[in-house]
Interface confidence: low
Amino acid sequence: ACDTATCVTHRLAGLLSRSGGVVKNNFVPTNVGSKAF
């Protein structure tokens, strides 16, 4: 299972995003996309 900080947030958010992760369904910028350095 995905266990990075990114993915933990993704599981809480529960919505697919085009960045390959998931995003919260609101307008507040949050760190929930596919982590990139």
Partner: antibody, heavy 122, light 107 residues
Framework: EVQLVESGGGLVQPGGSLRLSCAAS????????ISWVRQAPGKGLEWVAE??????????HYAEAVKGRFTISRDNAKNSLYLQMNSLRAEDTAVYYC?????????????WGQGTLVTVSS | EIVLTQSPATLSLSPGERATLSCKAS??????VSWYQQKPGQAPRLLIY???NRYLGIPARFSGSGSGTDFTLTISSLEPEDFAVYYC?????????FGQGTKLEIK
């Protein structure tokens, strides 16, 4: 203008300590996840440590090779990131880059510093 | 630890040609893959994140594809400034890992 400026590198003997700093400007530092990534001379990239944003409780994660020896921290009031490196080994010799990352959902921001060289040698 | 294997190690092409770089993960990483370009003496530069999303300001000739374990970076028509080392990375599991790099050189 966005800037990440690393400092604190230099020559240190095996077993010694160094504290790297990364000064950020031009963006809202406290919102960003920050990583240290290193590159040994002539080698590839290696992730070292990560500290999450203030809103994510500044949680930290480390590569196994540095766990227990390195400590990542941040001072959001000073827009600064730190890497305390103890018990240094020859294999820690590398250019150390700081990287800032923020995700808006539909886009991301990703910034790199130019790096600071750490040489561990007797 | 998830191992990323890039191929080829070196790719010799001419400007105007198409470049295809591969990155294979030892375990499934869904789409948690990014691609970076690095030139000598410079910091890495993010090109692609989320396997297929171009980062801000990255030219359209760069594209990424793949999911699961197999990923590809394609440069549709090489420009002189594209000759560099390219790395993939994964952020599906700690520790975050990078591939060993592909050197794209002028033929």
């Amino acid at each position: 203008e966005v800037q990440l400026v690393e400092s604190g590198g230099g020559l240190v003997q095996p077993g010694g300590s160094l504290r790297l700093s990364c000064a950020a400007s031009g963006f809202t530092f406290s919102n960003y996840w920050i990583s240290w990534v290193r590159q040994a001379p002539g080698k590839g990239l290696e992730w070292v440590a990560e500290i999450r944003s203030e809103s994510d409780a500044s949680a930290t994660h480390y590569a196994e090779a540095v766990k227990g020896r390195f400590t990542i921290s941040r001072d959001n009031a000073k827009n600064s990131l730190y890497l305390q490196m103890n018990s240094l080994r020859a294999e820690d010799t590398a250019v150390y880059y700081c990287n800032a990352y923020f995700d808006y959902g539909l886009a991301i921001q990703n910034y790199w510093g130019q790096g600071t060289l750490v040489t561990v040698s007797s | 630890e998830i191992v990323l294997t890039q191929s080829p190690a070196t790719l010799s092409l001419s400007p105007g040609e198409r470049a295809t770089l591969s990155c294979k993960a030892s375990k499934r990483v869904t789409t948690y893959v990014s691609w970076y370009q690095q030139k000598p003496g410079q910091a890495p530069r993010l090109l692609i994140y989320g396997a297929s999303n171009r980062y801000l300001g990255i030219p359209a000739r760069f594209s990424g594809s793949g999911s699961g374990t197999d990923f590809t970076l394609t440069i549709s028509s090489l420009e002189p400034e594209d000759f560099a080392v390219y790395y993939c990375s994964q952020s599906y599991n700690y520790p975050y890992t990078f591939g060993q790099g592909t050197k794209l050189e002028i033929k």
